[in-house]
């Protein structure tokens, strides 16, 4: 009688993370008389995967009944696969032995791949904001991907970039891979409203690629210019200053006036308009009464934008021409607004 | 080398459950076969338990089977043994033991590295 084959048909199988493995065997005689084990691995370092004779396996069940007399068939199904599981299986005939069975015939082995997706890309940005003409990193994170070759791209406002770095680890082979790219921006003052989008295709995918999202508005502050004007008189005594703060992002905004290098006002900045960009817009207005005065005043508009060290706008009020009232010493009325309630 | 060490033994009362773990050091952890075995006073050691590498496979004692179950995390370098309605006579030493190659049951020849041990009493 011809001796026994361990038939292995399946050089490879390629399974989605998730779903079950199906490794086909088969043996050409029930002689010689004894178990069947499945190892991952050849070699002494391999792992026992499934033994007929004793074991708990909850995710291994036999396609057969293996109890059978006359049973000839030793497929096993892995359930739940994880890219962990890659590997080559094979299928291996023990002869009845004492103490000990003894090893009699492998099967030919059969390579488990395993397909797994990558994880949703993480964007991240700095940790602390920049201004427009700086240049700024993104980076983009996924996971627990295989096999190991993937596409990644990043976008800005649906423009493709082309100043990253992106790498692949580990070099070797693994189970699973993970994909790093850092890419540079350079900020422009239209930003707010700009987005960075990284993009990962796989062949898990089938051709919808993941993408990870950063909003500019986190990373990018536009200061603020500043322009300080007198207005017409509204009253014999009384000068009208406003100081236009504008485009300006994020909202956080103090001003303060000084008159003559002294504290007048200091304000918040809250009804602010929006401009198209996504800046703001701000004006702040003092009253100033002329007659509290003998000389020329210095009125500064004085900004802390974002944390930032202050930036200031001075104007010089000329008081000589105006009559000097007696009795009075208010020099400005501490009333501030915003440009909707101005006049 | 594979340095092993147990922890999280104690005195419990009978039909308690206690968990067991030992992390594992000194070697790809990933690449090793585990197991737990006792010595009870005057008794020679016993497998408890053991789990192959990537965790798809377990063994266990007869007398321990559906009480116990063994479990791994391959990236803490730890082996657990969770031991369900305790009896007295589960009073012993339970060590934890690696292996670079591991037949099932035959895991106490093959065991390579061994810990110090951690008492569990089980008082009625």
């Known amino acids: 009688e011809e001796e026994l084959q361990v038939i292995q048909p399946d050089k490879s199988v390629l399974v989605a993370a998730g779903e079950t493995a199906t490794l086909r065997c088969t043996a050409t005689s029930l002689i010689p008389v004894g178990p069947i084990q499945w190892f991952r691995g050849a070699g002494p370092g391999r792992e026992l995967i499934y033994n007929q004779k004793e074991g708990h396996f909850p995710r291994v069940t036999t396609v057969s009944d293996l109890t059978k007399r006359n049973n000839m068939d030793f497929s096993i199904r892995i359930g739940n696969i994880t890219p962990a599981d890659a590997g080559t299986y094979y299928c291996v005939k023990f002869r009845k032995g004492s103490p000990d069975d003894v090893e009699f015939k492998s099967g030919a082995g059969t390579e488990l791949s395993v397909r797994a997706k990558p994880s949703a890309p993480v964007v991240s940005g700095p940790a602390a904001r920049a201004t427009p003409q700086h240049t700024v990193s993104f980076t983009c994170e996924s996971h627990g991907f295989s096999p190991r070759d993937i596409t990644l791209k990043w976008f800005k406002n649906g423009n493709e970039l082309s100043d990253f770095q992106t790498n692949v680890d580990p070099v070797g082979e693994s189970v699973s891979y993970s994909i790093h790219s850092t890419a540079k921006v350079v900020l422009t003052r239209e930003d707010v409203h700009s987005q960075v989008i990284c993009e990962v295709a796989h062949v898990t995918l089938q051709g919808d690629p993941l993408r990870g999202t950063a909003n500019l508005s986190e990373t990018i502050r536009v200061p603020p210019t500043l322009e300080v004007t007198q207005q017409p008189v509204r009253a014999e005594n009384q000068v009208n200053v406003t100081c236009q703060v504008r485009k300006f992002y994020p909202q956080r905004l103090q001003l303060t006036w000084l008159e003559n290098g002294n504290v007048s006002r200091t304000e918040t900045a809250s009804t602010v308009t929006e401009n198209k960009d996504g800046t703001y817009n701000w004006m702040s207005w003092l009253l100033v009464n002329v007659s509290a005065h003998r000389d020329d005043v210095k009125l500064t508009c004085q900004v802390e934008h974002d944390g930032q060290p202050a930036v200031s706008k001075s104007h010089d009020l000329k008081v000589s021409a105006h009559p000097k009232e007696q009795g009075s010493n208010t020099a400005a009325e501490n009333t501030g607004s915003n440009e909707r309630n101005i006049y | 080398q594979v340095q092993l060490q147990e922890s999280g033994g104690g005195v419990v009362q009978a039909g308690d459950s206690l968990r067991l773990s030992c992390v594992a050091s000194?070697?790809?952890?990933?690449?090793?076969?585990m197991g737990w075995f006792r010595q009870a006073p005057g008794k020679e050691r016993e497998f408890v338990a053991g789990?192959?590498?990537?965790?798809?496979?377990?063994y266990y004692a007869d007398s321990m089977k559906g009480r116990f179950t063994i479990s791994r995390d391959n990236a803490k370098n730890l082996v657990y043994l969770q031991m369900n309605s305790l009896k007295p006579e589960d009073t012993a030493v339970y060590y934890c033991?690696?292996?670079?190659?591991?037949?099932?049951?035959?895991?106490?020849?093959?065991?390579?590295?061994w810990g110090q041990g951690t008492q569990v009493t089980v008082s009625s």
């Open positions: 033991a690696a292996a670079l190659t591991f037949r099932g049951s035959d895991l106490p020849r093959d065991s390579n590295y």
């Open positions: 789990i192959s590498r990537s965790g798809i496979s377990q």
């Open positions: 000194g070697r790809a952890f990933s690449s090793l076969d």
